[in-house]
């Protein structure tokens, strides 16, 4: 909606300026254009080989950054966290899919709180803030063969170099391990004025 239009306006105007640089032949504008191409971004997909076993809220630390759809540029992935290298306004997003098939076993409880939390941690001033959360309480009856639930959150945030983004979920054993199902990412939209 409104956020998408604003992003299109910001990103679109930057592309127009970059294209103008080609016409004008200005080296200064060309430098700006190359800077645009180096805008930080990351798209991380779940690495399901090391999923925690509890049902409580846990931090997901295993993500792919360089295989399949996963890519990263001018950001750092370390110890399960996405680290900001450049100050700026970023669009953050996360998509989490939960699923259960009867062949996976019997659920310990049919009432499930399926949640995602996207958190920002600052090292310089030790603090942690939940930037986004989403989810629902579900009743996954044993009478059904298959259950599925998807959460998508996204938002626009001012981030500083060194700040870390992490993702926490409840009931991680229920995560859908496919790269098109469980992922998070960020891309820089503009500098801080």
């Amino acid at each position: 909606g409104a956020v998408q239009k604003e992003l299109q306006h910001i990103v679109g105007s930057q592309h127009i300026r970059a294209e103008k640089a080609m016409v004008d032949g200005s080296w200064l504008d060309l430098a700006k254009r190359s800077k645009l191409e180096a805008q930080p971004f990351a798209h991380l997909t779940i690495n399901a080989t090391d999923i925690p076993t509890g049902s409580h809220k846990v931090s997901l630390s295993s993500w792919y950054h360089d295989r399949g759809w996963a890519k990263i540029s001018n950001m750092t992935f370390s110890n399960g966290k996405l680290i900001v290298n450049q100050d700026g306004f970023y669009y953050l997003y996360a998509n989490i899919c939960f699923r259960h098939h009867e062949t996976s076993g019997d659920l310990a409880t049919e009432y499930l709180q399926l949640m995602v939390y996207v958190t920002k941690t600052s090292i310089k001033i030790p603090s942690s803030h939940t930037l986004m959360k989403g989810g629902s309480t579900k009743y996954w009856s044993g009478n059904s063969e298959f259950h599925f639930y998807s959460i998508n959150v996204g938002g626009f945030f001012k981030l500083r170099s060194g700040e870390e983004i992490s993702v926490e979920v409840s009931n991680p054993s229920l995560l859908d391990p496919d790269q098109d199902a469980t992922y998070f990412g960020a891309f820089k939209v503009r500098d801080i004025d």
């Epitope: 409580h56 846990v58 076993g105 659920l107 310990a108 009432y111 009931n171 229920l174």
Partner: antibody, heavy 122, light 107 residues
Framework: QVQLVQSGGGVVQPGRSLRLSCAAS????????MHWVRQAPGKGLDWVTV????????HYADSVKGRFTISRDNSKNTLYLQMSSLGPEDTAVYYC????????WGYGMDVWGQGTTVTVSS | DIQMTQSPSTLSASVGDRVTITCRAS??????LAWYQQKPGKAPKLLIY???SLESGVPSRFSGSGSGTEFTLTVSSLQPDDFATYYC?????????FGQGTKVEIK
């Protein structure tokens, strides 16, 4: 480190009651199902009861149904077993054990308490 | 309830031997089987879960296999620390049962 510390065992007369406790530390207690397993002197392991991570689901072996009650207090990280109408056949070492998976049943028990002895004798 | 039958009840072996213990379920339990090791006066220790998954920290000489009604625990090369009693444990529809145990003793 991850551990379960048990208390509450002892000698009790037939027909009386006893409550066992199991204090958890080193892991998020509220995220895991918990079991009680017993072992009679010189015998094998015998599953007694289980409770889900949130306390909503409880299951019992036929031999203790209606006599034993499992409960938990997640704010105190403690598991309980209330035993009533005790008989000599309940004499055993009782172990509390953590379920390996919090979400699913069936994955086994990966952390065990040290055991506490319950002797039912007149 | 599902009955679990372990064989043999007692097994005499030497250090370095390859040892196999069998566990049979009275009806299919898919892969919902765990193996434990217990030493005298101590609590059991989880070795294998879901029939073949090795528990964290357990030596790789231990392995599990099988599905349905027949399962095996194998110790590829028996070590002095492995002399103990081993139990299988099944899960099926909100019921858990243990096998009667297999004692592995020094030959």
């Amino acid at each position: 480190q991850v551990q379960l510390v048990q208390s509450g065992g002892g000698v009790v007369q037939p027909g009386r009651s006893l409550r066992l406790s199991c204090a958890a530390s080193g892991f998020t207690f509220s995220g895991y199902g918990m079991h009680w397993v017993r072992q009679a002197p010189g015998k094998g392991l015998d599953w007694v009861t289980v409770i889900s991570y949130d306390g909503s689901n409880k299951h019992y072996a036929d031999s203790v149904k209606g006599r034993f009650t499992i409960s938990r207090d997640n704010s105190k990280n403690t598991l309980y077993l209330q035993m009533s109408s005790l008989g000599p056949e309940d004499t055993a070492v009782y172990y509390c054990a953590k379920s390996l998976s919090g979400t699913y049943w069936g994955y086994g028990m990966d952390v065990w308490g040290q055991g506490t002895t319950v002797t039912v004798s007149s | 309830d599902i009955q679990m039958t372990q064989s043999p009840s007692t097994l005499s072996a030497s250090v370095g031997d390859r040892v196999t213990i069998t566990c049979r379920a009275s009806q299919s339990i898919s892969s919902w089987l765990a193996w434990y090791q217990q030493k005298p006066g101590k609590a059991p220790k989880l070795l294998i879960y879901k029939a073949s998954s090795l528990e964290s920290g357990v030596p790789s000489r231990f392995s599990g296999s099988g599905s349905g009604t027949e399962f095996t625990l194998t110790v590829s090369s028996l070590q002095p620390d492995d002399f103990a009693t081993y139990y299988c444990q099944q899960y099926n529809r909100y019921s858990w049962t243990f096998g009667q145990g297999t004692k592995v003793e020094i030959k």
